[in-house]
Interface confidence: low
């Protein structure tokens, strides 16, 4: 059966496709292409005769075919007008027609796509962005990437306009970009240019440090604070309710008990117009506020090597201290396998080694004092491995 | 005019599955997220899962995950819930739920219209 | 997953008064929160989105506030056709979660 197959089916706008001719009979007269689904003498591209080797332009030539001898048709400089159906007539020596039809369709070469948003610098919590990938074009996937990466499933990110137009909602900190688009069709693909955002927040909670309570008269206070914001957030200080200076850092000299009372740090955002603060408690001392034994427990005592893990934790009621851990009279956390958490208060081991048997202790202090709790010991046994058949393990 | 309707309710026993359908109209389909919501007469409304427009993405509640299937045919404007595994506690009136078409020029996933729902009675 | 509570879990009220109903979230859904009001033998039906802003077509006693973890429902004065159940729902995270409902009667 006489077949016809398109090379390619999807062509680029402005390149070539052939009509390729499959099963063509024997003893023929001549063949014809037509534009179309069916034989139409008005939408005629070219005839050629066999005896003569004579193509004969038709109605529908555009100057751009050249017929082979075989009967395939070469089409080239391709529009996205030449997309649809294509016909051939072959015609027998006996005169009894024959046809077939293949189809192919052009799309053009994408441009590079750039993202139009409306609102660049939206407010976190507060704004929604959307994000429009240009151009518009016909037959066109679009696709969008966030930080080089698809798409995640969230409440927060909304497709529409056929996933031209990428919507966040109520954005946060976090969703600075940077945001591709992609155009795709059969023939091309094409990516824009990242675009970024600058989400307005903050400013967060304050926080002022270093967090010591307590200092000796003589010493330099030196305090620093520091709110999430953007931009910056401006800082100012008041010492007792009454304001000090528009810096970030506080520095006072060889202070003495007159310089107790409460430190406040004023952060202010001037774009979302929100301000924050954080008050702290700075006392002066020539007495040494004197910290308690902590309290040291362990998850267990006893424990299998290479397989169970086991948290210390360090318990004290004093506040404004600092922790810290010791094992055979060294600072820990001493490897990979050891983490601290929540403040130091948590030792955890994981997984626990056979050089990890021994005492721990944990130690808290303030500037002016320190306490160390009762050692615990920590005994860490190795199962033997069982044994099949008399042989020994490994 | 806005229209959900749900079809594919019934009885079945414990262990079973069942398929509901539900047909949408009066709007762009595709480019909206779907949910499916069931009214249990012990735990009142629940969310059982959502589908994204195109069909790549899907979201369940824990109580239903590995046992429940959503999906859309874009092309017949139709949501479909795969219900397979059913237990006695998925009793319930099962409803297929659109968001509002735009808040503030965007599009979000609560439900704000509604079919009339579908009983699924899962008893021995 | 996020936990919503309602309270109280019944609240009975005479036409024409004022009902409040609260909704907590176990974390922070920012203003993500939905209010929806059903009735025997109905589909739900939306009052309020974005946890303030009252859906097309509800009456203006219906008003949202809250924001974070905290959400109250106010129905400034009572008709006979609100008594009903009334859910919240925060579409913040997956998977979305509703509140167990507060059912309000007539006293």
């Known amino acids: 059966q006489l077949t016809t197959e398109s090379m390619p089916f999807n062509v680029a706008e402005g390149k070539e496709v052939l009509l390729l001719v499959h099963n063509l009979p024997q003893q023929l007269f001549g063949y014809s292409w037509y534009k179309g689904e069916r034989v139409d003498g008005n939408r005629q591209i070219v005839g050629y005769a066999i005896g003569t080797q004579q193509a004969t332009p038709g109605p529908a030539n555009s100057g751009r075919e050249t017929i082979y001898p075989n009967a395939s048709l070469l089409i080239q400089n391709v529009t996205q007008n030449d997309t649809g159906f294509y016909t051939l007539q072959v015609i027998k020596s006996d005169l009894v027609n024959e046809e077939a039809t293949g189809q192919f369709h052009v799309y053009p070469e994408l441009p590079k796509p750039s993202i139009s948003s409306n609102n660049s610098n939206p407010v976190e919590d507060k704004d929604a962005v959307a994000f429009t990938c240009e151009p518009e074009t016909q037959d066109t996937t679009y696709l969008w990437w966030i930080n080089n990466q698809s798409l995640p499933v969230s409440p927060r990110l909304q497709l529409s306009n056929g996933n031209r137009t990428l919507t966040l909602l109520s954005v946060t900190r976090n969703d600075t970009g940077p945001y591709e688009c992609e155009i795709q069709n059969p023939v091309s693909a094409n990516r824009s240019d990242p675009v970024t955002l600058n989400v307005t927040y903050g400013p967060d909670t304050p926080t002022i440090s270093p967090s010591d309570t307590y200092y000796r008269p003589g010493a330099n206070l030196s305090l620093s604070c520091y709110a999430a914001s953007n931009p910056p957030a401006q800082y100012s200080w008041l010492i007792n309710g009454t304001f000090q200076q528009s810096t970030q850092e506080l520095f006072i000299p060889n202070i003495t008990v007159n310089n107790s009372g409460s430190y406040t740090c004023h952060a202010n955002n001037s774009v979302t117009g929100c301000n924050r603060t954080t008050v702290k408690t700075i006392i002066v001392t020539e007495l040494s506020p004197v910290v308690a034994k902590p309290q040291i427990k362990a998850s267990k005592t006893t424990v299998t090597g290479d397989k169970d893990s086991v948290n210390l934790t360090c318990s004290t009621n004093d506040t404004g201290i600092s922790i810290r851990w010791f094992f055979k009279n060294q600072s820990l956390p001493s490897s990979e396998r050891m983490k601290l958490s929540q403040g130091n208060t948590t030792l955890s081991i994981n997984p626990v080694k056979r050089e990890d048997a021994g005492t721990y202790w944990c130690e808290v202090f303030n500037p002016i004092s320190k306490n160390q709790s009762d050692p615990i010991m920590l005994n860490v046994n190795y199962n033997a491995l069982p044994q099949e058949n008399g042989l020994s393990p490994g | 005019e806005v229209q959900l309707l749900e079809s594919g309710g019934g009885l079945v026993q414990p262990g079973g599955s069942l398929r509901l359908s539900c047909a949408a109209s009066g709007f762009t389909f595709i480019n909206y997220a779907m949910n499916w919501v069931r009214l249990t007469p012990g735990k009142g409304l629940e969310w059982v899962s959502v589908?994204?427009?195109?069909?790549?993405?899907?979201y369940y509640a824990d109580s239903v995950k590995g046992r429940f299937t959503v999906s859309r045919d874009n092309s017949k404007n139709t949501l479909y819930l795969q219900m397979n595994s059913l237990r006695v506690e998925d009793t319930a009136i099962y409803y297929c739920a659109s968001p509002p078409p735009m808040v503030r020029g965007v599009i979000i996933t609560i439900g704000n219209y509604w079919g009339q729902g579908a009983l699924v009675t899962v008893s021995s | 997953e996020i936990v919503m509570t309602q309270s109280p879990a019944t609240l009975s009220v005479s036409p024409g008064e004022r009902a409040t109903l609260s909704c907590r979230a176990s974390?922070?859904?920012?203003?993500?929160l939905a209010w929806y009001q059903q009735k025997p033998g109905q589909a739900p039906r939306l009052l309020i989105y974005?946890?303030?802003t009252r859906a097309t077509g509800i009456p203006a006693r219906f008003s949202g506030s809250g924001s974070g973890t905290e959400f109250t429902l106010t129905i400034s004065s009572l008709q006979s056709e609100d008594f009903a159940v009334y859910y919240c729902q925060q579409y913040n995270n997956w998977p979305f979660t509703f509140g167990p409902g507060t059912k309000v009667d007539i006293k």
């Open positions: 974005g946890a303030s």
């Open positions: 589908i994204s427009g195109s069909g790549s993405g899907t």
């Open positions: 974390q922070s859904v920012s203003v993500n």
